[in-house]
């Protein structure tokens, strides 16, 4: 399968427009709003967990959210929603967000795992490097509020709402 | 590989009620919505409803309301279809279908033929 | 509910015959178009989906095409296993529907 999105009138909340495939964009239709971490399967006639497809070759319409998915269930790595990206937090300690605190007090305390650069900043040398500096302070983190990717915990996220068209 | 296997043939009374089943292997069953499509002999197919063995979630076709539920048993990776009060327009084969969520049903049961008969 | 319409219900053709089977849309369905094949007491099985794409293991001389409300199935050279029974179904909108059929008969 080749991932066509199904979401072009779908309607997540706060869906990635640009996640779409070009013949996603679907304008016939009126959009259905799902609650966030869903997604709306029109033929299905209702709203699904995007967890149910994050391991199939579908899961453009979910492409977001499965990728914090993924990236949540790797150590020492947190998705920014902001960039979309699954940031390692080994290349940002130091100036790290709280999903990374973990991470980063734990590398601190032993030097030796550090990178050199992170090495030096620990003993006082301060690399300037201006593109950087900064970068992570100011975003909204909302990856610290998902939760584990754990069936049947969180039920508002995981049950399919029954949307009756 | 995919494969769906239907329970087999049954031959039941006005009035009665059947239960096919429809067991899966080679993917992760629980994630997959499976749909059921009922063939009257010698005509097309028609969509009766799906059901989403992740959460048990159902959707029935409104002519199939009241007549069909659809349920799963995620321990044998299995659904099941049962239509209640039967009549001679419930003979067909009742096909188990997987969905694809492109809008397709890309594996199917090998289809139970039902047949009602005084 | 979304009408299918496929013509012609049924058609003769002998083996090398390029054949043509169309499917028309009550209403815009997009390229959310899925062809079947059915073959006598067997389960149908998907051949194509959204409008051309050949489901695996699908031979090359099916095609499709189309878009909106009118698609095509073409088999361009007929072999002895295409005789059948052809469905579309369109794969857009709640509740998923399907095409009356066209069969495919040896002349």
């Known amino acids: 399968m080749s991932g066509l999105g199904r979401s072009r009138r779908g309607g997540r909340s706060r869906v990635d427009q640009e996640e779409r495939f070009p013949q996603g964009l679907w304008t016939g239709v009126a959009m259905r709003s799902c609650p966030e971490e869903q997604y709306w399967d029109p033929l299905l006639g209702t709203c699904m967990s995007c967890k149910t497809i994050c391991n199939h070759q579908s899961q453009r319409t979910c492409a977001a959210f499965c990728r914090s998915l993924s990236c949540r269930k790797e150590q020492g790595k947190f998705y920014d929603h902001l960039l979309r990206d699954c940031i390692s937090c080994a290349s940002i300690c130091g100036q790290h967000p709280k999903q990374c605190a973990y991470f980063c007090e734990n590398k601190l305390r032993s030097p030796v795992n550090l990178p050199p650069e992170l090495r030096r900043q620990r003993s006082g040398e301060v690399e300037n490097n201006s593109d950087n500096s900064g970068r992570y302070q100011g975003l909204e983190h909302r990856g610290s509020e998902a939760s584990p990717a754990l069936p049947g915990l969180k039920l508002s996220a995981d049950q399919v709402a029954l949307v009756y068209s | 590989q995919v494969q769906l296997v239907q329970s087999g043939a049954e031959v039941k009374k006005p009035g009665a009620s059947v239960k096919v089943s429809c067991k899966a292997s080679g993917y992760t069953f629980r994630n997959y919505v499976m749909h059921w499509v009922k063939q009257k002999p010698g005509q097309g197919l028609e969509w009766m409803g799906w059901?989403?063995?992740?959460?048990?979630?159902?959707k029935y076709a409104q002519k199939f309301q009241g007549k069909v539920t659809m349920t799963s048993d995620k321990s044998t990776s299995t659904v099941y279809m049962e239509l209640s009060s039967l009549t001679s327009e419930d003979t067909a084969v009742y096909y188990c279908a997987r969905y694809d969520y492109e809008g397709s049903f890309d594996y199917w049961g090998q289809g139970t033929l039902v047949t009602v008969s005084s | 509910d979304i009408q299918m319409t496929q013509s012609p219900s049924s058609l003769s053709a002998s083996v090398g015959d390029r054949v043509t089977i169309t499917c028309r849309a009550s209403q815009d369905i997009s390229n959310y178009l899925n062809w079947y094949q059915q073959k006598p007491g067997k389960a149908p099985k998907l051949l194509m989906r959204y409008t051309s794409l050949l489901h695996s293991g699908v031979p090359s001389r099916f095609s499709g095409s189309g878009s909106g409300t009118d698609f095509t199935l073409t088999i361009s050279s007929l072999e002895q296993e295409d005789f059948a029974t052809y469905y579309c179904?369109?794969?857009?909108?709640?509740?998923?529907?399907f095409g009356g059929g066209t069969k495919v008969e040896i002349k």
């Open positions: 059901i989403l063995p992740y959460n048990d979630g159902t």
């Open positions: 179904q369109q794969g857009n909108t709640f509740p998923p529907t």
